[in-house]
């Protein structure tokens, strides 16, 4: 999905309203400089990209996220301010009910929740110099 | 654990040719700008150049403008630096740095290689 | 293209504090970052956009950039601070990095 026609400011409102504090919930009891930057992003679409990728794609030692409070917000988000997305989360809305399993919040889980927080820090930052 | 691995460095002579790679580890290699930073024996950091983190843009210091070229492979987290047309002032060890970008801003450069030593000399 | 002027050299007793300067035109417009390079080894980002730290740096290293100079402070100094110290800014006129020429900093 190519997230450019996204209505950004709507969605930055959505994060700092809820899926912030979501996001601070999950982690209670990690210290913040626990888990160093190991995905970055570049722009506002790049970033919501790799904000997509790490919240619904399962990876290594961390089964899935999608169920968490802050991953159905953030759907619900793009759902609504990035036009057609729904019809494009469809399918992959399918298989991954297929794949529920039992919630269980590893280390693995937390380093990606902890990259997702700087992704959308990324997001939501104003460039404060223009060099 | 993150890392930046240089290869490829060694003695060449004047106007030939040497191609640097940079393997990288640990983090995601695609999301991230990626610089060639070199400094000769005793002398100070020079940047050489830099690619987007898709690899649709780079830029290069004047002094290696036209003669070097910097690529990456995101399928494989590689960078590369072609060096063509060799001089004895190329003499350095070369590093490669990541850096996060936000537009066509490079932010600093947080993650080093260890340098690999290239040698122009007849 | 822009230039970014270091001293050659910077000395502290130890325990006192360090300062090693940045001049550019303008500079405290441009986000400024800093690293330190111990003999033989890579450099080592210490301050970046100004005055933010990595979380792998101690809180002794700060930053500061207004007007026409940055600065990096070394407060506490130690016999391990001793390195070369680089300061960095990303050009976007020119699309280029620029590197100030290093400060040696030693700790007397």
């Known amino acids: 999905y190519d997230f450019t026609n996204c209505d950004f400011e709507k969605i930055k409102a959505a994060y700092l309203s809820t899926i912030s504090k979501d996001l601070i919930t999950y982690m209670s009891g990690t210290k913040s400089t626990e888990f160093n930057n190991t995905v970055s992003c570049s722009n506002r679409p790049h970033c919501l990209t790799e904000i997509q990728s790490l919240t619904f794609n399962p990876t290594a030692g961390c089964a899935s996220l999608a169920k968490e409070m802050f991953a159905m917000k953030t759907k619900a988000a793009l759902a609504i301010w990035c036009p057609g997305y729904s019809e494009t989360q469809i399918n992959a809305t399918q298989a991954m009910k297929k794949r529920r399993k039992r919630k269980v919040t590893t280390n693995k889980c937390l380093e990606q929740v902890s990259q997702l927080q700087g992704l959308w820090r990324r997001f939501n930052r104003p460039l404060l110099k223009q060099q | 654990q993150m890392q930046l691995v240089e290869s490829g460095g060694g003695v060449v002579q004047p106007g030939r040719s040497l191609r640097l790679s940079c393997a990288a580890s640990?983090?995601?290699?695609?999301?991230?700008?990626m610089h060639w930073v070199r400094q000769a024996p005793g002398k100070g950091l020079e940047w050489v150049a830099v690619?987007?983190?898709?690899?649709?843009?780079?830029h290069y210091a004047d002094s290696v403008k036209g003669r070097f070229t910097i690529t990456r492979d995101n399928s494989k987290n590689t960078l590369n630096l072609q060096m063509n047309s060799l001089r004895a002032e190329d003499t350095a060890v070369y590093y490669c740095?990541?850096?996060?970008?936000?537009?066509?801003?490079?932010?600093?450069?947080?993650?080093w290689g260890q340098g690999t030593m290239v040698t122009v000399s007849s | 293209s822009y230039v970014l002027t270091q001293p050659p050299s910077v000395s502290v007793a130890p325990g006192q504090t360090a300062r090693i300067t940045c001049g550019g035109n303008?500079?405290?417009?441009?986000?400024v970052h800093w690293y330190q390079q111990k003999p033989g080894q890579a450099p080592v980002l210490v301050v970046y956009?100004?005055?933010d730290r990595p979380s792998w740096i101690p809180e002794r290293f700060s930053g500061s950039n207004s007007g026409n100079t940055a600065t990096l402070t070394i407060s506490r100094g130690e016999a391990g601070d001793e390195a070369d110290y680089y300061c960095?800014?990303?050009?976007?006129?020119?699309?280029?990095?620029?590197f100030g020429g290093g400060t040696k900093l030693t700790v007397l």
């Open positions: 740095a990541r850096s996060p970008q936000w537009e066509e801003i490079f932010e600093a450069m947080d993650i």
């Open positions: 640990g983090f995601t290699f695609r999301t991230y700008g």
């Open positions: 690619v987007w983190y898709d690899g649709s843009y780079t």
């Open positions: 303008n500079i405290g417009s441009k986000s």
């Open positions: 956009d100004d005055s």
């Open positions: 960095q800014i990303w050009d976007s006129s020119s699309s280029l990095v620029v």
